[in-house]
């Protein structure tokens, strides 16, 4: 029987009455066009909803937008369009919400053709009031907040000017012209690329990378011959054109661009690309595209300096620059990532790593599941997960995989069981141990979300027909109850819950269609009365993450330490609550060779954990050097994996070698590092 259908499933008592008392409908008094929703702040209950409606007329498009505000997690909405003078808001810029609990909101308005500049509406009180401000430029991008100070904003203009405001958009100053891309770094630093001759496109590969640490008073050129740049964790990356040909290479800096090192990664040609898949303060996952239009490349993982890279996964699916990749950070368990590979026969298979890219394996076949038509052997197959690529291919996959840091171990995803991803209608699978084991959670495609740090999972069937039923589970997806939230079914468009999965409210969005009109409608359901008591100590049990073999002394050790968590028992129906903090206890493991990566000039032979000196350096290894000039590279062949906390045990000591190489990069010559003032 399907999950939740057997009679022994744990029932939640009187849930219909409890939910009926906590279901709130709001019908929006405007025509169905598009709707966008933003949460303002954390645990504030404030939601802004912007509805827009376009009527194409003969010469132009007539547009109308309305702004609504809720301060009770979506149970009630108030039309506040008059606060923005009934102005039409440009949806492509969305609602720029300030970082953390700043309460700041910027809306970008549509202005008539001949105006000198754009117009914004600013709020710094969680959208209770707005101030209209006319801009001295037409914005090309959404306003970007400095992560450190929400009063500092930057934006690019349609004429490629870089504009900065120091007073939350009240006054703007153009600090540089001919800017292609700008990003906030740490400590209110701005990094940006500039062109000298024609345009961003024409000068691609000849751009300069600049930095200002004082909001435009002074500048420093920190790179030339730049193709693009990116920030990830504490690393600043730039792809730089080679002198001799049209290839480019990655250079990395960990001091905001003062000094650079060439990364030990293959160079790429014009049609190829690099992509930072994930980064933290310890390391980076880098995708390097394969030559030709293959749709795949190689994942490399970095050392702690971002310089030395180990090959992590071949044939990694990544369609084009800015295209689709299924690479997913499983945020509910440290070290876990899921992605897809394109196999030789062009089928797509899911791979998972539990140790931050050290080893990749197939996902274990869910218990009590049968292999589908893609499987050669009906008894041996794997689970394959649908993610961004499947969604882009318009498969029947309404949602990407879901995990939340405070819902430890839980991963929910659409998938199929076979030798490869299937185009058949997928089912929804859940893992409660961070991806080691899986079970079918729901039959057919669904929308799903996690509430109360995993205490409740909510799902809605993906259907082309109108719906009026929501499903929920209080035991991590084992048993499901269904609740009819309205008599009149609606055309469902989305589930919305407060980011962070701490809320107990869920909003179901959709529209009703009648003979002449269709209207937006939302239903907000509060589950607080289902979880009627606060969880106590007895409601939690102890769980060891990454456990695979209790008889192994180092069971659970990943990156040099193991972690035990207090997790809610599946049978406990109680509230974790908004202030819930994951309780975990780490313990350090003994070091083994697995805790070390091979440093530059060394490699691991197949099925060996020892690092062996490379007999000769070829290709990109030969070009690699430190700080862009001839350098003594001293190594004993091993380097601790970034973030690894092991102590004692194996300490791989090999003879220290000096690896001298002729540097091939003149990416940065000292004369280029001149400071400029505005």
């Amino acid at each position: 029987s399907a999950p939740g259908e057997d009679e022994e499933c744990g029932r939640v008592r009187d849930f219909v009455a409890k939910l009926a008392n906590n279901t709130h409908q709001h019908v929006f008094d405007d025509l169905r066009g598009s709707v966008s929703l933003s949460w303002v702040g954390d645990s504030t209950g404030v939601i802004l909803v912007l509805t827009t409606f376009h009527v194409p007329l003969v010469i132009m498009t007539f547009g109308q937008s309305k702004l609504y505000r809720s301060e009770d997690y979506g149970k009630n909405f108030k039309d506040i369009t008059d606060l923005i003078n009934n102005t039409f808001i440009r949806t492509e810029f969305g609602m720029a919400i300030g970082p953390e609990n700043s309460g700041k909101v910027v809306l970008t308005a549509e202005v008539s053709g001949g105006s000198r500049g754009g117009r914004i509406f600013r709020s710094s009180d969680f959208a209770k009031n707005f101030v209209q401000t006319d801009l001295p430029f037409h914005p090309l991008t959404q306003m970007m907040y400095s992560p450190q100070n929400s009063d500092y904003l930057l934006a690019l203009s349609t004429e490629n000017g870089l504009w900065v405001s120091k007073n939350f958009g009240g006054k703007w100053e153009e600090i540089h012209k001919a800017v292609c891309l700008a990003k906030w770094g740490s400590d209110n630093t701005i990094f940006f690329t500039t062109y000298a001759n024609g345009s961003c496109k024409a000068d691609l590969g000849a751009l300069e990378l600049w930095r200002t640490s004082d909001l435009g008073k002074s500048f420093k050129t920190i790179g030339v011959k730049i193709y693009s740049f990116g920030l990830g964790g504490r690393f600043l990356f730039a792809s730089v054109m080679a002198d001799k040909d049209t290839t480019r290479r990655i250079h990395v800096s960990t001091d905001q661009g003062d000094t650079w090192s060439m990364a030990q990664l293959p160079s790429v040609g014009q049609e190829q690309f690099y992509s930072i898949l994930a980064a933290n303060d310890d390391m980076v996952f880098m995708h390097v595209d394969e030559p030709g239009d293959t749709g795949f490349g190689t994942i490399f993982t970095s050392d702690d300096r971002g310089i030395v890279y180990s090959k992590s996964l071949d044939r990694h699916l990544y369609t084009t620059t800015g295209g689709e990749t299924d690479f997913t950070n499983v945020t509910s368990l440290r070290g876990v990532y899921i992605t897809s590979v394109l196999s030789e026969d062009n089928s797509i298979q899911t791979m998972i790593t539990f140790d931050q890219g050290g080893r990749w394996t197939h996902l274990r076949k869910p218990e009590n599941s049968e292999c589908d038509a893609t499987a050669k052997n009906k008894n041996e197959c794997s689970l394959h997960i649908h993610a961004s690529y499947s969604i882009s291919q318009k498969l029947n996959v309404p949602m990407a995989p879901l995990s939340e840091p405070n819902a430890v171990g839980i991963v929910i995803a659409h998938g199929s069981v076979g030798d490869a991803i299937s185009v058949m209608v997928p089912d929804v699978y859940i893992s409660d141990d961070g991806g080691y084991s899986w079970t079918k959670m729901l039959e057919g495609p669904h929308y799903y979300t996690i509430l109360d740090s995993g205490g409740i999972i909510v799902a809605i069937e993906h259907s082309s027909r109108p719906i009026n039923v929501i499903k929920f589970s209080t035991d991590e997806g084992q048993c499901w109850q269904t609740y009819t939230f309205t008599r009149d079914p609606i055309y469902f468009t989305g589930l919305a819950s407060e980011p962070g999965a701490r809320s107990m409210n869920i909003s179901i969005w959709g529209f009703t269609e009648s003979f002449l009109t269709s209207q937006w409608v939302s239903y907000t359901i509060d589950f607080k009365d289902i979880l009627e008591r606060n969880c106590e100590e007895k409601d939690y049990t102890i769980w060891l993450a990454h456990s695979t073999d209790p008889e192994d002394y180092e069971d659970g050790c990943i990156l040099g330490y193991k972690e035990q968590f207090l997790r809610l028992r599946k049978s406990s129906v109680c509230q974790n609550g908004r202030d819930y903090v994951v309780t975990k206890q780490p313990s350090i493991c003994l070091c083994s060779l697995e805790d070390f990566l091979c440093d530059f000039g060394a490699y691991r032979p197949e099925n060996d954990s020892k690092c062996v000196e490379q007999p000769e350096l070829k290709g990109h290894d030969l070009e690699f050097c430190l700080y862009g000039r001839e350098e003594h590279l001293t190594t004993n062949g091993y380097r601790k994996i970034p973030g690894d906390k092991c102590q004692g045990g194996v300490n791989p000591v090999r003879e220290v070698k000096d690896l001298k190489k002729k540097c091939t990069s003149n990416f940065l010559s000292p004369e280029k590092q001149n400071s400029k003032s505005n």
Epitope: G409, D433, D475, K538, A545, H546, P550, D552, D555, K562
Partner: antibody, heavy 124, light 106 residues
């Protein structure tokens, strides 16, 4: 093969404390929870609490909260159960048992290895 | 805490009989139930874990079933060595045992 060997029988006065030890051999002691279960004469089994040696995470049945302390010494692969404020109804055989484990959950798979039991008699 | 109710408390049977013992939990415990056999003066012995998984070394005449709140231990053909007391134990809340079922010779 894993074995749990418990300390010998004890006779105690009401109001005093008793500390029973349980030494493991032949397995990875640190990776399994050790539970303490008691059985009064002619009665059923009663769980008192348990401990995970790695990290020393202990939890107790509500009935014994505040009166029982369970500890573990990883270096000697030994678990201890101390029961204070003894009364005559604490007269029982006290067992330590290893919680079997197939996944990361410590207490979910039953107790697969048991000690031989320690008889504690509380009498004035 | 979760209460476990075992029935019957005593059961008289003969060698070769099919014996069924039931255990009811006061709330759903999914499949987190174990069954033990105990003989006088001895420590209990694990027979079944996770409601239906047979512990290694236990004869296949023992089987367990159920999930949620209702569970059953079945001995398909009672052997002389099987006369003992049987306990169920839930593991999803703080551990609790059933009151026990004594299987005696008819």
């Amino acid at each position: 093969q894993v074995q749990l060997v418990q300390s010998g029988a004890e006779v105690k006065k009401p109001g005093s404390s008793v500390k029973v030890s349980c030494k493991a051999s032949g397995g990875t002691f640190r990776n399994y929870a050790i539970s303490w279960v008691r059985q009064a004469p002619g009665q059923g089994l009663e769980w008192m609490g348990g401990i995970i040696p790695i990290g020393g995470w202990a939890n107790y049945a509500q009935k014994f909260q505040g009166r029982v302390t369970i500890t573990a010494d990883e270096s000697t692969s030994t678990a201890y159960m101390e029961l204070s404020s003894l009364r005559s109804e604490d007269t029982a055989v006290y067992y330590c048992a290893r919680q079997g484990r197939k996944t990361g959950y410590y207490y979910y798979y039953g107790m697969d290895v048991w000690g031989q039991g320690t008889t504690v008699t509380v009498s004035s | 805490d979760i209460q476990m109710t075992q029935s019957p408390s005593t059961l008289s049977a003969s060698v070769g009989d099919r014996v069924t013992i039931t255990c009811r939990a006061s709330q759903s415990i999914s499949s987190w139930l174990a069954w033990y056999q105990q003989k006088p003066g001895k420590a209990p012995k694990l027979l079944i874990y996770k409601a239906s998984s047979l512990e290694s070394g236990v004869p296949s005449r023992f089987s367990g079933s159920g999930s949620g709140t209702e569970f059953t231990l079945t001995i398909s053909s009672l052997q002389p060595d099987d006369f003992a007391t049987y306990y169920c134990q839930q593991a999803d809340g703080h551990i609790t045992f059933g009151g026990g079922t004594k299987v005696e010779i008819k």
